[in-house]
Interface confidence: medium
């Protein structure tokens, strides 16, 4: 993570004191310009060797309140013939994010930052097999 | 795009007037933070028939001010000998995860939250095969 | 790459402090936290706390909580351990580390040290 | 605090052997550990780290393994420069904490 400005104004804190409450402008900005969400949907869950399907994770006092979540279709991954290979196997790419999330009965309205951990994608790696030893 | 929560206290308020500037929790940053769960070991960007690099992208006035971002290694896949199958792509999951940009010369500090498309990882996919007319 | 250059060794009296600076070159000073960690002579390693500069935090381990200070100054790359109420417990080498602190393999904050300073030799002894 | 125990204390090896060192926490710790190596009077080098990513400069006869609880540091064909001390280190929970260190020497 990164910055500290350091001046009299802006001393170092402790993080049990730290400044529990600051200002955070919520017009969501997209720092690639263009809008992202505007991007087509993958079909990628449906063509790859490791499918997966998408979940609707919701939460009204969220940001974002809808979140899809990733979980693969089957534990081992899809052969050229359309079969299960048993020494393939399908595993879960995930990832943090940052959410909002409001404080209860909070007004003016008051948000914490929570990391959340997802499921994005699947893909396909070769079992490991494990010696006896 | 922003939470609007309903309360009597709190009207309901138009996207477009609502409070840019709202108290935020960043409690999630002490160093060690609120974390979700223990990390997971993965290595599958290694292991993958749709193996991937870590890319460094780097902003010092944004939290995380590093993020390493997948590119796939291969336009194909990994077949079982290790070889490339000319039938199978690699293709990039990618994810959109909110970031804090710090606003310049703010103190106390004042963050606006963008969105940013990252690459997490890749998966192997069936080439789609265009049909001449 | 990263290099932390510290401040040169000290020798002091039981009761008093020491200020030891660490100096960063190469890489944005704000992409990452300093963490510091003392080694007694022939003894391991010991965490005694660190900055995450984003927010300007710090954090400290709970042995060390009332008498370490950790201090980073943007302008001049430099961070800062004083360490006040010294003992002869308290002689050691005192190094900085690099803490990443990035968004690396699908998670936030990395806390592996991936760069050390030199270290500096603290003295106490009457 | 998490305690993070490594075995052994010592290892006395001969060149071109291989090297298993094992650190156990406390408690889980998911994959986050990391593996030092430090040699007389110098300052502790990072090798792995989140318990099986190599970095970039350090020889691929180093390598880890584990997650959870049980975590390995494996050296592959010692060399005679691999003569140091070897730390763990969690930082899945604060305080950060370490092994107290293998020493290994060549015979």
């Known amino acids: 993570a990164a910055i500290i400005p350091q001046s009299s104004a802006c001393p170092n804190t402790e993080a049990k004191d730290f400044l529990q409450n600051v200002k955070v402008n919520l017009k969501v900005f997209n720092s690639l310009g263009a809008k992202v969400s505007s991007r087509r949907p993958s079909d990628y869950l449906n063509r790859s060797t490791s499918p997966w399907t998408l979940h609707r994770n919701e939460d009204p006092d969220r940001y974002p309140s809808v979140i899809w979540e990733a979980q693969c279709r089957h534990q081992r991954c899809v052969n050229a013939e359309g079969k299960l290979d048993h020494h393939m196997n399908s595993v879960l790419i995930q990832q943090e994010i940052l959410v909002l999330k409001r404080e209860p009965e909070s007004c003016p309205f008051t948000f914490r930052v929570e990391k959340m951990l997802v499921g994005v994608g699947c893909t396909c790696v070769a079992s490991i097999v494990r010696q006896a030893a | 795009a922003a939470i609007i929560p309903q309360s009597s206290a709190c009207p309901n308020t138009e996207a477009k007037d609502f409070l840019q500037n709202v108290k935020v929790n960043l409690k999630v940053f002490n160093s060690l933070g609120a974390k979700v769960s223990s990390r997971r070991p993965s290595d599958y960007l290694n292991r993958s028939t749709s193996p991937w690099t870590l890319h460094r992208n780097e902003d010092p006035d944004r939290y995380p001010s590093v993020i390493w971002e997948a590119q796939c290694r291969h336009q194909r896949c990994v077949n079982a000998e290790g070889k490339l199958d000319h039938h199978m792509n690699s293709v990039l999951i990618q994810q959109e995860i909110l970031v804090l940009k710090r606003e310049p010369e703010s103190c106390p500090f004042t963050f606006r939250v963008e969105k940013m498309l990252v690459g997490v990882g890749c998966t192997c996919v069936a080439s789609i095969v265009r049909q001449a007319a | 790459e990263v290099q932390l250059v510290q401040s040169g060794a000290e020798v002091k009296k039981p009761g008093e402090s020491v200020k030891i600076s660490c100096k960063a070159s190469?890489?944005?000073?704000?992409?990452?936290?300093i963490s510091w960690v003392r080694q007694a002579p022939g003894q391991g390693l010991e965490w005694m706390g660190g900055?995450?500069?984003?927010?300007?935090?710090?954090d400290y381990a709970q042995k060390f909580q009332g008498r370490v200070t950790i201090t980073a100054d943007e302008s001049t790359t430099t961070a800062y351990m004083e360490l006040s109420g010294l003992t002869s417990d308290d002689t050691a080498v005192y190094y900085c580390?690099?803490?990443?602190?990035?968004?690396?393999?699908?998670?936030?904050?990395?806390?592996?040290?991936?760069?050390w300073g030199q270290g500096t030799t603290v003295t106490v002894s009457s | 605090e998490i305690v993070l125990t490594q075995s052994p204390d010592f290892q006395s090896v001969t060149p071109k052997e291989k090297v298993t060192i094992t650190c156990r926490a406390s408690?889980?710790?998911?994959?986050?550990l990391h593996w030092y190596q430090q040699k007389p009077d110098q300052s502790p080098k990072l090798l792995i780290k989140?318990?099986?990513h190599s970095i970039s400069g350090v020889p691929s006869r180093f390598s880890g393994s584990g997650s959870g609880t049980d975590f390995t540091l494996t050296i592959n064909g010692l060399e005679a420069e691999d003569a140091a001390t070897y730390y763990c280190?969690?930082?899945?929970?604060?305080?950060?904490?370490f092994g107290q260190g293998t020493k290994v020497d060549i015979k």
């Open positions: 580390a690099r803490e990443p602190n990035d968004f690396w393999n699908g998670y936030y904050d990395t806390h592996d040290f991936d760069s």
């Open positions: 900055i995450t500069h984003f927010f300007g935090i710090t």
């Open positions: 408690q889980n710790i998911g994959s986050e």
């Open positions: 989140y318990a099986s």
């Open positions: 280190h969690q930082s899945d929970t604060l305080p950060h904490t």
């Open positions: 190469g890489g944005s000073f704000r992409s990452y936290g």
